[in-house]
Every structure is written in C-alpha cells, then in structure tokens.
Interface confidence: medium
C-alpha cells in the first residue's frame, strides 16, 4: 500500500495579473511533483520582497516567461 502523502503546494492563491518584468527580482518554476500536482510559478517582486504565485495557464504569464527566457538567452555567452 503506498504511503499517503500530504499535498503540500506552496501557493495559497494564484494571480492571473500581468507582471512587469522590470519589477521582478526573481522567477522560480517548480515542476509538479508527488507533493504538489501542479506547476507553481513564484515571482519575487522587488517591492516588499513579495512572493506572488502566477498562473502557468494565463496568456499574460506565458508571455512573461517568454520575455524572461529571451532576456536570459541574450545575457548568456
């Protein structure tokens, strides 16, 4: 019998609001796992050190991820 695991997603609530890449301190993508069945995207904002949870399905967030990865690839040698 498999051990029952507590579902431990980090995010309390998820935002669909667009995020200005300039206000971002850091962006973390946590893949789905045995502890949390969904992908979690955590954006650390420069103001307040606030950690926002972004909706991976939102068009605005998908665009943000594209912009951030584009910016990263520009910076990498």
């Amino acid at each position: 019998v498999p051990l029952s695991r507590t579902v431990r997603c980090t995010c309390i609530s998820i935002s669909n609001q667009p995020v200005n890449p300039r206000s971002l301190e850091k962006l973390e993508i946590i893949p789905a796992s045995q502890f949390c069945p969904r992908v979690e995207i955590i954006a650390t904002m420069k103001k307040k050190g606030e950690k926002r949870c972004l909706n991976p399905e939102s068009k605005a967030i998908k665009n943000l991820l594209k912009a951030v990865s584009k910016e990263r690839s520009k910076r990498s040698p």
Epitope: R8, T10, C11, I12, S13, I30, E50, K51, R52
Partner: antibody
C-alpha cells in the same frame, strides 16, 4: 499539520544578546516560496515585525531595528534563529515566529507559534 | 502609538453582529490590502482574513472582511461565546517599507 514553537530565555539582562529559536514542523524551508518571520508584542503595545528569512536565504529586517538583529536558518533541524543585541527593558514582550507562504502577500502569516515571553531586567 | 488604529474594546451578545474597524492612511491601507488575526486566550494567533476579504480554509463564514479607502473592517455575524478574543489588523506601509499592525481590539461576548 503546521506547528511552530518559540524557545529562549525568559529573562535577559540589559546590554545582553537575546537568542530565540523557532522550531517548526509540517513544512520545510527548503520549499520555494516559504518564509519564517519573527514578530513581537511589548506589553500593552501593538505587534511589531522584526525579521524574515526566505527559503532562498534572503533576509529582511525591520529598518528601525536592523543594526541589532540577525536571522538565520538550519533547514536540517527545521529551525530559525533570531539574535537581538544590546537588549533594553523596552524590548520586554512576547516574541512570536510565524510562517509566510507565497501568493498571499508579504504580511499574511498563516500559522503562528504560541509566543515566548522575554523580560529584560537587571 | 500604532500605525493602524483600532478601538481597544468591543462587545456584543450571542447572535449579534459586531464590526471592528481598522483605520490607516494612504501609505498603508489606502494602497495595500488588509489582513485580520484572532488571538484566543492562551492560544497562538491565527489568520482570519487576508487580502481584505479572503477567508483561509477552516474559518467560518461568520467572519468577513472589507476595505474602503484607508480603512478596513472585520464583521462577525452571529456572535458566539468562543469569539471572545483579541483581534488585530495588519497591512503594509509603503513609507515605512514594512508590515504594520493595529493595537488590537479585545472583544467581549456578554
């Protein structure tokens, strides 16, 4: 079930350094988006936030107390330690640790410890 | 002196509706959300309301929150004897760049 428990000396002499430990269970500070914060309440006064540490070891301090505070974590022991130097009788009060989770705003503490009372007196 | 102002005490009889106010300014409640905490006698504080009007799971719907301008309100409808506790509001202050709290309201159920 998430629990947090504060421990430390009940009595501290003026000018001494206070060391408080928050031992928690039910979550891990290795998980992205988790944070632990220290808050205090002097008798008859409002709650006041002191310091916060994030899973990525980012540290935030109350500006007015920044020079006296240091926060650290030991993820293997599930503990967060707060040190406060140069203690004064006005630092007497109940000290709490609490948990912050991503997605709820930077001042939403969804689980708290019972608090530990610290008296500063010679 | 607290940054957020709450009445020191409030009271009501079982079944009544009680409102606790939390007054701030444009730099805190005016531009940020309000949260409410309950501290029962001898217990750890607990989150009652976050983001102005959101209830965490497990909090009865007798508790509700709202925000208007630079003030927040906590409403307890159908007051019960176990609601006797201290209630605190909290927000973020852009000028102080930190979390701020109200002085607390002691609620007595008569």
């Amino acid at each position: 079930q998430v629990t947090l428990r504060e421990s430390g000396p009940a009595l501290v002499k003026p000018t001494q350094t206070l060391t408080l430990t928050c031992t928690f269970s039910g979550f891990s500070l290795t998980t992205s988006g988790m944070s632990v914060i220290w808050i205090r309440q002097p008798p008859g006064k409002a709650l006041e936030w002191l310091a916060r540490i994030d899973s990525d070891d980012e540290k935030h301090y109350n500006t007015s107390l920044k020079t006296r505070l240091a926060i650290s974590k030991d993820t293997s022991k599930n503990q967060v330690v707060l040190t406060m130097t140069n203690m004064d009788p006005v630092d007497t009060g109940t000290y709490y640790c609490a948990r912050l989770r991503a997605g709820s705003g930077p001042y939403v503490f969804d689980s708290w410890g019972q608090g530990t009372t610290v008296t500063v007196s010679s | 002196q607290s940054v957020l102002t709450q009445p020191p005490s409030a009271s009501g009889t079982p079944g009544q509706r009680v409102t606790i106010s939390c007054s701030g300014s444009s730099s805190n409640i005016g531009s940020n959300t309000v949260n409410w905490y309950q501290r029962l006698p001898g217990a750890a504080p607990q989150l009652l309301i976050y983001n102005n009007d959101q209830r965490p799971s497990g909090i009865p719907d007798r508790f509700s929150g709202s925000k208007s301008g630079t003030s927040g309100s906590l409403v307890i409808s159908g007051l019960q004897s176990e609601d006797e506790a201290d209630y605190y509001c909290a927000s973020w202050d852009d000028s102080l760049n930190g979390r701020v709290f109200g002085g607390g309201t002691k609620l007595t159920v008569l």
